[in-house]
Interface confidence: medium
């Protein structure tokens, strides 16, 4: 989907971000249409995530003069991960295997996958409100990092988990940055 917006972009100030595990999420995923891939390992002692570890970030947005009425909730995609066990990276084979190559796991990173364009309202000191569109991350995915390329390279091999349903007016591809532009 190509967004036809011609809105002016504004810089912003973001207040400190406390991160919370997705299990503590206060977002109603049924309400927001989200079916996020759970970050469940193969066994409880696993040190590397199977799929992505999805952290919840809560922050207030400001345009310098006005601040968001309610905190913005989004995902932060971070850390190492492993592709789904159907991929040929597993040692020992079989559905019940609990062991995998530590070396290969280090080539996989959890990055932004799905985003949505969301409207926010900012409250101003004079009592007025302002409205903007911002892009927030709604799902993460495990991507394979090709080591011979620079860290800033976009040479990724993608393994997407279950596609999250979105119920949003505009949908955009995620950038690797989680910074917001007000528009």
């Amino acid at each position: 989907f190509k967004n036809d917006a011609t809105e002016i972009l504004y810089s912003h100030v973001v207040k400190p971000v406390p991160a919370h595990p997705s299990s503590n999420s206060t977002l109603n995923q049924a309400r927001n249409g989200g079916r996020h891939f759970s970050s469940t390992g193969l066994d409880r002692n696993s040190r590397v995530q199977v799929g992505c570890r999805e952290l919840r970030s809560t922050k207030y947005i400001s345009d310098g003069q006005c601040t968001s009425i309610s905190p913005l909730k989004e995902l932060v995609c971070a850390g190492e991960c492993l592709p789904l066990p159907v991929l040929p990276n597993w040692i020992g084979g079989g559905y019940g295997t609990k062991y995998w190559s530590r070396r290969s796991s280090q080539e996989w990173r959890c990055v932004n996958d799905k985003t949505r364009t969301q409207r926010i309202q900012l409250q101003c000191q004079d009592g007025s409100t302002r409205t903007y569109k911002i892009t927030v991350v709604t799902a993460c995915k495990c991507k394979r990092y090709t080591r011979q390329h620079n860290e800033s390279s976009h040479n990724f091999e993608s393994v997407s988990p279950a596609k999250p349903a979105q119920h949003h007016r505009e949908r955009k591809r995620a950038s690797k940055s989680s910074k917001h532009s007000l528009s």
Partner: antibody, heavy 123, light 107 residues
Framework: EVQLQQSGPELVKPGASVKISCKAS????????MNWVKQSPEKSLEWIGE????????TYNQKFKAKATLTVDKSSSTAYMQLKSLTSEDSAVYYC????????????????WGQGTSVTVSS | DIVMTQSHKFMSTSVGDRVSITCKAS??????VAWYQQKPGQSPKLLIY???YRYTGVPARFTGSGSGTDFTFTISSVQAEDLAVYYC?????????FGGGTKLEIK
């Protein structure tokens, strides 16, 4: 009380332009996107586009991009839609409508509508 | 663009009856559907958003359900003042699109 008061009916000639106004009251004008919708017997309801009163930024339905221009005047809490190069197919009722969304930023729908402005294109 | 199809252009019902209006999306729109009521000579009025959320002040007899591509709007006990055209609208992607409308007629 939230109100959207639209300008009166227009009778215009083919090829001409018309500018419809929508004056908002009862809420913070810059706090909500303003949408415009066309209603004709042939095509039911069609979304034309929306404007952010805070920034003046617009998003158009591709179908209406060459037809409609959306603007706002924050000082008077008024949204405008100009329609150009009018033909008989543009004869319709046009509505402005405030976009409702929850505090979580989703759940979009148009919760307050103007009374509509009838535009008739005839020679 | 996503096409919203309301298969029934007209529906006839009696006061006190339960009536359901259906709407089908041409692709998955999750729960991003709103329902509007338009009475003769009036502007549309928002009843339901996000498929099942009743807008402020809307009577409890109006309900919405569905997700994906199939949606239903129900009036549990039709009143005489419910005579109107009902429209579904998807707000999943731009441009938002409306169904053709279902006119509810009271017998």
């Amino acid at each position: 009380e939230v109100q959207l008061q639209q300008s009166g009916p227009e009778l215009v000639k083919p090829g001409a332009s018309v500018k419809i106004s929508c004056k908002a009251s009862g809420y913070s004008f810059t706090g909500y996107y303003m949408n415009w919708v066309k209603q004709s017997p042939e095509k039911s309801l069609e979304w034309i586009g929306e404007i952010n009163p805070t920034t003046g930024g617009t998003t158009y339905n591709q179908k209406f991009k060459a037809k409609a221009t959306l603007t706002v005047d924050k000082s008077s809490s008024t949204a405008y839609m100009q329609l150009k190069s009018l033909t008989s197919e543009d004869s319709a009722v046009y509505y402005c409508a405030r976009l409702h969304y929850d505090y979580d930023g989703v759940g979009y729908a148009m919760d307050y509508w103007g009374q509509g402005t009838s535009v008739t294109v005839s020679s | 663009d996503i096409v919203m199809t309301q298969s029934h252009k007209f529906m006839s019902t009696s006061v006190g009856d339960r009536v359901s209006i259906t709407c089908k999306a041409s692709q998955d729109v999750s729960t991003a559907v709103a329902w509007y009521q338009q009475k003769p000579g009036q502007s549309p009025k928002l009843l339901i958003y996000s498929a099942s959320y009743r807008y402020t002040g809307v009577p409890a007899r109006f309900t919405g359900s569905g997700s994906g591509t199939d949606f239903t709007f129900t009036i549990s006990s039709v009143q005489a003042e419910d005579l109107a055209v009902y429209y579904c609208q998807q707000h999943y992607s731009t441009p938002p699109t409306f169904g053709g409308g279902t006119k509810l007629e009271i017998k």
